[in-house]
Interface confidence: medium
């Protein structure tokens, strides 16, 4: 019995559903009562899902698998794996037995896009040409491990004093921190590129340093000029710093973080102690760094509703304040493509192609292209619906008259993460069914 599976690994984004395709050719008169179908992990032989004695025996794999029962009789033995995790990566074997027996293994490659890198500079005050600084490029919650490249403002590689560490969290996703130690010139741009080798996704950040003396006078409060970009569910640091004078003690410090627009109190440090979070118990100060002038705020488990401007007020003898913007983001899933009608297609038929991508933020930009990269802007309807967490599901529908053959591709862009997710469908001129049979 010939069992067919894809040669290439199935790539699935963490948190999305994956289909492990497997098919066989049923003979005339075949009935499901004759079928024994077993999915198992190739290496450990752990049972994943089975269909025997004419019925679905269900999932033996964390209740996250399902068969396409209505398609089994046509020879479609594919397995749907829901809410993919890093731990799912590996090889799955599809065993099919009717009278004869056959099996084949399909690989699942799990992936997660890296966030747009955040760049930090240490020290970040009173910088002069010739000073040695440490620039840290941090990108979060990606998989598999990233490749990191540094460049200067003219594209020249900076490979000298670079240390890159990658730490997996409890879900197996990596946070990458790459540290470049460099001697400042008169001015310079330092850029870090974080590549996901499976998704071939590049995320990059850069920082431009112009050494100069800081002005004197009132307390100078420094925050990043660019918005802090934080992925939903991760922790964000809203950086804020001041320059303590010699002899400064925390008893002199009044530090208040508040929402810029509503003036709602977020966190405070007064009378020599941390007054705690006034913002859903999700904020914290870096108390051990306060005396050195680090007034940054840690915001935990970021939500869409946290997006906006936060003001950092610092009062010692003098007073100063500055506002930092928090931009919340979530990557869009790889689009799934559906075609209607999807059988017996011929040139001249009008079809509706739907491109769906899930749980991203902010709203996506959607672009359609043909197989030569030419935009398809004609009959396109795109809808974006926010769920209860404020994350968007995007559905873009292209209505098109089929030519002799053609590729229709949809690109879903997250404008904040500069993350592109794309899907495509190729329709040939012969009468055909979509998706093509394995």
């Amino acid at each position: 019995l010939e069992v067919q599976v894809p040669e290439d690994p199935v790539v699935a984004l963490v948190g999305t559903d994956a289909t492990l395709r497997c098919s066989f050719s049923p003979e005339p008169g075949f009935s499901l009562a004759q079928l024994n179908l077993i999915w198992q992990l190739t290496d450990t032989k752990q049972l994943v899902h089975s269909f025997t004695e004419g019925r679905d025996q269900g999932s033996a794999y964390a209740n996250r698998t399902a068969l396409f029962l209505d398609l089994l009789a046509q020879g479609n033995a594919s397995l749907r794996l829901q809410r993919v995790r890093v731990a799912d990566e590996g090889s799955f074997t599809c065993f099919v037995s009717i009278r004869d027996f056959g099996s084949a293994a399909v690989s699942l490659q799990v992936a997660a896009p890296y966030s747009k890198p955040s760049m930090t500079l240490e020290p970040n005050k009173d910088l002069r040409p010739g000073d040695t600084v440490t620039i840290t490029c941090s990108s979060y919650r990606g998989y598999p491990e990233a490749e990191v490249f540094w460049q200067d403002g003219q594209g020249a590689p900076l490979t000298g004093n670079v240390t890159t560490s990658q730490m997996a969290n409890e879900q197996g996703l990596f946070d990458v921190h790459s540290v470049l130690r460099v001697v400042l010139g008169a001015n310079g741009t330092y850029s870090c590129l974080v590549r996901n080798p499976v998704l071939q996704q590049d995320a990059h950040g850069s920082i431009t340093i112009t050494p100069q003396r800081s002005p004197t006078g009132a307390v100078e409060v420094q925050v990043p000029e660019d918005p802090v970009v934080a992925l939903v569910g991760t922790d964000a640091t809203l950086r804020c710093s001041f320059s303590p004078e010699p002899g400064f003690s925390l008893a002199q410090l009044n530090l208040i973080w508040q929402l810029t627009d509503t003036k709602q109190l977020v966190h405070s440090f007064t009378e020599g102690r941390d007054q705690g979070s006034a913002y859903a118990n999700r904020t914290a100060l870096f108390l051990d760094l306060l005396a050195q002038g680090n007034a940054s705020l840690r915001l935990q488990r970021v939500r869409v509703a946290d997006e906006g401007s936060f003001t950092c007020f610092v009062s010692i003898r003098d007073f100063g304040s500055a506002a930092v913007s928090l931009q919340v983001a979530a990557p869009y899933s790889k689009p799934s493509m559906t075609l209607e009608p999807n059988k017996d297609l011929r040139p001249g038929d009008t079809v509706t192609i739907t491109c769906s991508s899930y749980r991203g933020y902010p709203e996506a930009e959607v672009f359609w292209q043909d197989g030569q990269g030419a935009p398809l802007t004609g009959n396109v309807t795109t809808s974006q619906m926010a769920n209860e967490q404020g994350l968007f599901d995007v559905h873009s529908v292209l209505r098109v008259v089929l030519g002799a053959n053609g590729t229709y591709s949809c690109l879903v862009r997250n404008p904040v993460l500069q993350q592109d997710a794309h899907g495509s469908v190729t329709i040939t001129g012969q009468p055909m069914t979509f998706p093509p049979e394995a």
């Epitope: 490249f149 594209g155 590689p157 741009t189």
Partner: antibody
């Protein structure tokens, strides 16, 4: 039109030096780095080094570090490459090229026409 | 140094053929550029950042790859495509080119 125009062919004796010029026009000379690449007869391309005309920072291929000097004159939008202690294996066509693009993707988009340097006793 | 090894070094093909040139890096690079050179002329940019077509380059040229393996594909050879092709990286010093692939008429 963006152009890099190089000086003419040179014939030199072993042990001497050669200085090749590369005049830029049609763009802001200080906005891009100028690189020098050479190609020996029937061989591939070999990078020698570059200069940032704005900061005058240079970086060289270690292979040539002790023999090559790249300079730039902002007032005339001209870059120069001087190679000293010439030997017969330095016989090659020498190209200047502009390294263009933007972070993080860069490439040589404009090349000079090439200068043939022949080293022969 | 990162060595770039192109294969094949020589390739004979006919007009209309689909050809693929591979460039392998001795360690991972951030992206690859590709150039075309004709005898007596300076190189010309074809593909930048692995897969982006340079301005004015016909769409029959395409690039792909990541990490250590990159490819340049010409989908249907035209008479003017017979030339030498070079890959180039600058992820670490020194900037390096592949040794070249000479594409000749069969």
């Amino acid at each position: 039109e963006v152009q890099l125009v190089q000086s003419g062919a040179e014939v030199k004796k072993p042990g001497s030096s050669v200085k090749v010029s590369c005049k830029a026009s049609g763009y802001s000379f200080t906005s891009y780095t100028i690189h020098w690449v050479r190609q020996a007869p029937g061989q591939g391309l070999e990078w020698m080094g570059y200069i940032n005309p704005n900061s005058r920072n240079t970086d060289y291929n270690q292979k040539f570090k002790d023999r090559v000097t790249i300079t730039a004159d902002k007032s005339t939008s001209t870059a120069y490459m001087e190679l000293s202690s010439l030997r017969s294996e330095d016989t090659a066509v020498y190209y200047c090229a502009r390294y263009s693009g933007s972070t993080p993707y860069w490439y040589f988009d404009v090349w000079g026409q090439g200068t043939t340097v022949t080293v022969s006793s | 140094d990162i060595q770039l090894t192109q294969s094949p070094s020589f390739l004979s093909a006919s007009v209309g053929d689909r050809v693929t040139i591979t460039c392998r890096a001795s360690s991972s690079v951030s992206y690859m550029n590709w150039y075309q050179q004709k005898p007596g002329k300076a190189p010309k940019l074809l593909i930048y950042a692995t897969s982006n077509l340079a301005s004015g380059v016909p769409s029959r040229f395409s690039g792909s790859g990541s990490g250590t393996e990159f490819t340049l594909t010409i989908s249907s050879l035209q008479p003017e495509d017979f030339a030498t092709y070079y890959c180039q990286q600058w992820s670490s010093n020194p900037l390096t080119f592949g040794q070249g692939t000479k594409l000749e008429i069969k």
